[in-house]
């Protein structure tokens, strides 16, 4: 077991986008027995890196209030890509 903490992170899509990659989904489980969406990569010049709070390995629980549970990977990707200019992420950090 491990401790987790949740945080709301508000990002503004910048010139190089949100600037992170995701893995996971019901059809692409990245963590055993967990179909959640996880951050796999953060681009050094993207909005997420400049904000500084999002970390590789974080689990993203929701985007703009929309729950990411039980989503196909592609549907999760589309949700992020269509999330607009101001993007609110509810994330779970492992401590």
């Amino acid at each position: 077991d491990y401790l987790v903490t949740e945080e709301e992170i508000n990002l503004t899509r910048g010139p190089s986008g949100l600037g992170f990659n995701i893995v996971g989904g019901t059809d692409q489980q990245y963590v055993s027995n967990d179909s959640g969406i996880y951050v796999s990569e953060i681009d050094e010049n993207g909005a997420a890196a400049l904000d500084g709070r999002l970390q590789e390995g974080d689990k993203i629980l929701s985007v703009n209030g929309q729950d990411l549970k039980n989503l196909l990977h592609q549907d999760a990707v589309d949700l992020f890509r269509n999330a607009g200019y101001a993007v609110s992420l509810r994330v779970q950090h492992r401590l």
Partner: nanobody, 128 residues
Framework: DVQLVESGGGLVQAGGSLRLSCAAS????????MGWFHQAPGKEREFVAE????????GYADSVKGRFTISRDNAKNTVYLQMNSLKPEDTAVYYC?????????????????????WGQGTQVTVSE
Amino acid sequence: DVQLVESGGGLVQAGGSLRLSCAASGRTFSSYTMGWFHQAPGKEREFVAEIGGTGGNTGYADSVKGRFTISRDNAKNTVYLQMNSLKPEDTAVYYCAAVIGSPTDSSDYRSSLDYDYWGQGTQVTVSE
């Protein structure tokens, strides 16, 4: 980590076709977004095309839309770039690249900095 090996380059006349292949080693190939970039002499490496892990998301540079097609075979750990209606300005070294996961941004934002793993490149020369 992933090792990438490109093949299929060569010399072709303008208007001709080539199919590039990129074989990847390592497991969980379907978790990687795969891309192709090209680099002409004296120029920076430029995005050509990319494909998501399940093949659902594809993106292309404006200069190759309608001429190039990217595809992948996850059972063979291979990504392909079918290049049709080739032009002399397509002459370059073509590189295969990989990054774990799917970018949350469309390919309009893509640059070589977004990819972590690279092949050694294969030369494509298009003559007049």
